[in-house]
Amino acid sequence: KSSNEATNITPKHNMKAFLDELKAENIKKFLYNFTQIPHLAGTEQNFQLAKQIQSQWKEFGLDSVELAHYDVLLSYPNKTHPNYISIINEDGNEIFNTSLFEPPPPGYENVSDIVPPFSAFSPQGMPEGDLVYVNYARTEDFFKLERDMKINCSGKIVIARYGKVFRGNKVKNAQLAGAKGVILYSDPADYFAPGVKSYPDGWNLPGGGVQRGNILNLNGAGDPLTPGYPANEYAYRRGIAEAVGLPSIPVHPIGYYDAQKLLEKMGGSAPPDSSWRGSLKVPYNVGPGFTGNFSTQKVKMHIHSTNEVTRIYNVIGTLRGAVEPDRYVILGGHRDSWVFGGIDPQSGAAVVHEIVRSFGTLKKEGWRPRRTILFASWDAEEFGLLGSTEWAEENSRLLQERGVAYINADSSIEGNYTLRVDCTPLMYSLVHNLTKELKSPDEGFEGKSLYESWTKKSPSPEFSGMPRISKLGSGNDFEVFFQRLGIASGRARYTKNWETNKFSGYPLYHSVYETYELVEKFYDPMFKYHLTVAQVRGGMVFELANSIVLPFDCRDYAVVLRKYADKIYSISMKHPQEMKTYSVSFDSLFSAVKNFTEIASKFSERLQDFDKSNPIVLRMMNDQLMFLERAFIDPLGLPDRPFYRHVIYAPSSHNKYAGESFPGIYDALFDIESKVDPSKAWGEVKRQIYVAAFTVQAAAETLSEVA
């Protein structure tokens, strides 16, 4: 087949026609439509939105749009028995209680079904005891407490500030420290940018605002009751005691007004250094317990949430490819929100909606993409990436054979400063080339390319004249596609200036104040940043689905593999004596990386020269590119994390949001000096080097000439 048989317009005009059809005004309209009521996973409102999106995608012109439902474990507060935390006196009387809900934003006072702040999947319980302040509850914070300060958290209720790492890691760390309850709070140091008013007058977090969120440690398992398999009608479900990743101690989130009431009375040890102090007018004493006058008072948690198996609905739309219908490019983002979802997820869902509309418009004019494009509106992302994971589990055999790429589409904005991209190295060149063709929306960069403003504002730390592109971690719906299945993945959104804004995420994240007005008034009144993100996400999908040769450059993987090998080697070399004692060598890894580099270079040369009019050879070369990401998958997975199977990247064991390179080696080396059996520990390091070297070498060989 001729490469243009799929279309009645020239390839260059295709992309322009697609991008020109994207309109900021439509994104604005869709965002408004998606944010007027809450769309909590498992609720009737979110089911109705799924049906609305299904109907609209059909109208837009997709070939088919289906609902895929699953019955998964979700978590909800008890409507008649609210969750709260008390300060109790020596007689057990409650002298202070934390808030039961956030003050509703203006205009939303009469909206029903606003779920009060809660930590999803917290067990029930009413623990009482002394408080210990544990900073961000990171691994290093507990090391500081336990090893340096000799403070024992066993039997204590810990209070931790949100930020820096995924909340589930905080809870896991607290559990391992022996805590019997966890209070999470948003400190103004992390969620209140100086010089900006709090909502509704600005985009900062008010004192009554609270961040919701799940506290699971799923490690990629999906539904806690059906790990590895879809939660369908005939699923075998584990008992709750065997469920994956559930916390074992009660957890509850609060705002900074309530946190002030708890922290102002803290006694015990002073904070170890200034990095443990937030911005509240409290001493940030670590504890345990309250100071002198209040030493007989305790903290009591009242948690009554329930875990329930509930039906969720993904929307899956298909635009069939004309030439390679058995090759799938997927654009997916979630639909469920904690409350209104003004940013998370609907700023992303509105962009997906407009991308679908644009593709549909082209299709109605007679165009089709070369490859099949799948569009997904995922459910229950907020409860542990459940919708995407269950669908991928159900379709894993198809995906591992046919999946070309996955582009994620959660929140389009977390700021309005510059672009932020996390992706596989295979997509670096695609992203660079695309952003060079797009106009920058930034003030002061009129007439300049997006690439130029992005590079200026967010330069690569390694390569001058290039923008920063980060590793994929997790905490979003690309996880199953990339970390489990090895499908090349990427994500893009507009972000804040990380140099000047040190707060974590955006201040109103997962609060009731994440409204349409937040976006329209304060973040993107002209929706120009949303439009740019639509162009980046849509443009990536367009190129991946339509270019004759897949827009992957395997040489970029070679470059990062060398960088990651150097990094992990330098970490190991902090223990030169042990390396010598236990004969630890990285030679095999560096050798494999060298081989990969040479083979990738030769493959790229062949890619320039081969006969693109020969459909068999074209398909063969494209398959080598498509399957390269797959080649980094270890079927056995990482130690104790069977669903994290990518050998080059995994979510950090200390922060699900962050990506770690050579995670098997990294985890084997982590805190190795404290291991009781150094011989065994260094043996595991050697095993992980072996696994990594083998995997890199095996991946390299997939790029060799086939015969």
Partner: antibody, heavy 124, light 110 residues
């Protein structure tokens, strides 16, 4: 227009009960802490009780503790004061008042909106 | 919960400045910066004049100012005017999580 209107006052015998209401309008009632303050004839102001915006915290003056209950119905934009075991010394004009700060967990930032008051007379 | 101590009355001529004191204890006025001042004309509801010791709500004349020293808070009215004649009450947050008012001060403009 931001407004508080008290109702429910009247003449009642000692030992009996009365329920006062305060209807709020013109502002986001469900985001504000609310107070009851009273003023006996010819006397000064006496703070009676406060309730947080969500009803999670209620505090009372010693003189009414155990007899009076403050409550609110945010869906009706209404504040209540249930007064039981009334005494002659409870005779006063009862005002409801709004705490100044929206969304605050405190209730000590100053009362910036007041009703016109409703008169309660306890007499045998 | 004893009432805060205020002078029963103060007076001043138009244009003069007057100060009303409000004395409490370390468990209320001295311990917190949550002192408010209210003006009440006869037969009317009170009006907030000062909050958090020294802050003026919008719409309140800058002739009204507040301060605190130790366990005593003060309200100062400068450039006294006839319409300032009213009863003035202070209030403070207390250690027992309650509020307490002062006994009130009658201001007479001579």
């Amino acid at each position: 227009e931001v407004q508080l209107v008290e109702s429910g006052g009247g003449v009642v015998q000692p030992g009996r009960s009365l329920r006062l209401s305060c209807a709020a309008s013109g502002f986001s009632f469900s985001g504000y802490g609310m107070h009851w303050v009273r003023q006996a004839p010819g006397k000064g102001l006496e703070w009676v009780a406060v309730i947080s915006y969500d009803g999670s915290n209620k505090y009372y003056a010693d003189s009414v503790k155990g007899r009076f209950t403050i409550s609110r119905d945010n869906s009706k934009n209404t504040l209540y004061l249930q007064m039981n075991s009334l005494r002659v010394e409870d005779t006063a004009v009862y005002y409801c008042a709004r705490d100044r700060i929206w969304g605050s967990r405190g209730y000590y930032y100053g009362m910036d909106v007041w009703g016109q008051g409703t008169t309660v007379t306890v007499s045998s | 919960q004893s009432a805060l101590t205020q002078p029963a009355s103060v007076s001043g001529s138009p244009g003069q400045s007057i100060t009303i004191s409000c004395t409490g204890a370390s468990s209320d006025v001295g311990g917190y910066n949550y002192v408010s001042w209210y003006q009440q004309h006869p037969g009317k509801a009170p009006k907030l004049m000062i909050y958090e010791v020294s802050n003026r709500p919008s719409g309140v004349s800058n002739r009204f100012s507040g301060s605190k020293s130790g366990n005593t808070a003060s309200l100062t009215i400068s450039g006294l005017q006839a319409e300032d004649e009213a009863d003035y009450y202070c209030s403070s947050y207390t250690i027992t999580s309650t509020l307490v008012f002062g006994g009130g001060t009658k201001l007479t403009v001579l």
